[in-house]
Amino acid sequence: LIIGFGISGRHSITVTTVASAGNIGEDGILSCTFEPDIKLSDIVIQWLKEGVLGLVHEFKEGKDELSEQDEMFRGRTAVFADQVIVGNASLRLKNVQLTDAGTYKCYIITSKGKGNANLEYKTGAFSMPEVNVDYNASSETLRCEAPRWFPQPTVVWASQVDQGANFSEVSNTSFELNSENVTMKVVSVLYNVTINNTYSCMIENDIAKATGDIKVTESEIKRRSHLQLLNSKAS
């Protein structure tokens, strides 16, 4: 969490951003909130990016003002216009790419004063893993697959019964570059699996951590998976 305050001149207002991560090939949100003003026409929102000459986005007098917008953000940005009045200056970014990573500044002017806060935006790829029993294998084997990750993640297997066990000797992980030559498909195979046990395939990079669980019994197979973004620090 980054909390910024205004500088000299008029009164300062509090602006708060949250460091976040964008999944390339999806829309992303850069979070920013501020002390609201009662009059929309008095609010100015400017988003800037370190190293970029033009503005990322500008909203003033109740509408978008994009004449100074940098070419790399043309057609891609939006604020939530109906939520500006309640202090939401968050930015929606269409079709996030690796090059969108960097330091952004959310700069606010209201009738109460000015304020700004920086935001670190990371970009990469992350996806939910799916764990299945590999019936083609000669022994009891599990196969964990996740379609798109970047940067290259680590994959660790764990089991409920053998807690703390190191499965690196009985697992094999491969990374296959996807057709767009950025993201990679993750495939990890775990050998010598025992029945009546729950196994977890954990995939992690500096942006996200995802886990796929599978419980194999004689009568059924239960699966569960979840994904968590790692770097949600507010400022």
């Epitope: 090939g25 999806e26 057609g75 940005t77 939006a78 269409k94 798109r148 767009e180």
Partner: antibody, heavy 116, light 109 residues
Framework: EVQLVESGGGLIQPGGSLRLSCAAS????????MNWVRQAPGKGLEWVSV???????DSADSVKGRFTISRDNSKNTLYLQMNSLRAEDTAVYYC??????????WGQGTTVTVSS | EIVLTQSPGTLSLSPGERATLSCRAS???????LAWYQQKPGQAPRLLIY???SRATGIPDRFSGSGSGTDFTLTISRLEPEDFAVYYC??????????FGQGTKLEIK
């Protein structure tokens, strides 16, 4: 040259299935938001489905549960699997790339007629 | 659900005249996500304007877009014979994800 070419349209009976294809050249499908848009005879444009660069998909309520958008990255091709077809699905179906600057590349369209 | 309403439904003008087409949204639309398309009979639509006011590649400068919030305008400063067609506005980002207006037919008077 950046191009999209649709195929797979035809005459189909109500309740039937059809798969449309859209072959892309000059750009990588999986880096863009790829869409299917349709136009019923004498009517306006109606958005049908999108597949994001990430592979996630979304569809209009009118086709949810019946139509499935997908892509084959190795073939650089977009698909629309249409099941449980109805008379109101009769239209010209276009695939379109939504680059950063709107739907800037369109195919020539393929005609789907649903009739008994 | 966001609805885009275009007016007029049909616009009858002569070559050389100025055309003003309107697109009104039922709720606020980001300027970045508002586009205009031209469609001629038997052809696929063609992107004219993106980001409410930026001309797409190869589009003549007689076409211009303006507006913000809920009211957007496409202006053709001096009509050429090839400009007579149907024009659609389109938004991105709300539910449904993409929405088109019903179209304005620009015909020769």
């Amino acid at each position: 040259e950046v191009q999209l070419v649709e195929s797979g349209g035809g005459l189909i009976q109500p309740g039937g299935s059809l798969r449309l294809s859209c072959a892309a050249s000059g750009f990588i499908v999986s880096r863009n938001y790829m869409n299917w848009v349709r136009q019923a005879p004498g009517k306006g444009l109606e958005w049908v489905s999108v597949i994001y660069g990430s592979g996630r998909t979304d569809s209009a309520d009118s086709v949810k549960g019946r139509f499935t958008i997908s892509r084959d990255n190795s073939k650089n091709t977009l698909y629309l699997q249409m099941n449980s077809l109805r008379a109101e699905d009769t239209a010209v179906y276009y695939c379109a790339r939504d680059g950063d600057y709107g739907m800037d590349v369109w195919g020539q369209g393929t005609t789907v007629t649903v009739s008994s | 659900e966001i609805v885009l309403t275009q007016s007029p439904g049909t616009l009858s003008l002569s070559p050389g005249e100025r055309a003003t087409l309107s697109c009104r949204a039922s709720q606020s639309v980001s300027s970045s996500y508002l586009a205009w398309y031209q469609q001629k009979p038997g052809q696929a639509p063609r992107l004219l304007i993106y980001g409410a006011s930026s001309r797409a590649t190869g589009i003549p400068d007689r076409f211009s877009g303006s507006g913000s919030g809920t009211d957007f305008t496409l202006t053709i400063s001096r009509l050429e014979p090839e400009d007579f067609a149907v024009y659609y506005c389109q938004q991105y980002g709300s539910s449904p994800l993409y929405t088109f207006g019903q179209g304005t037919k620009l015909e020769i008077k």
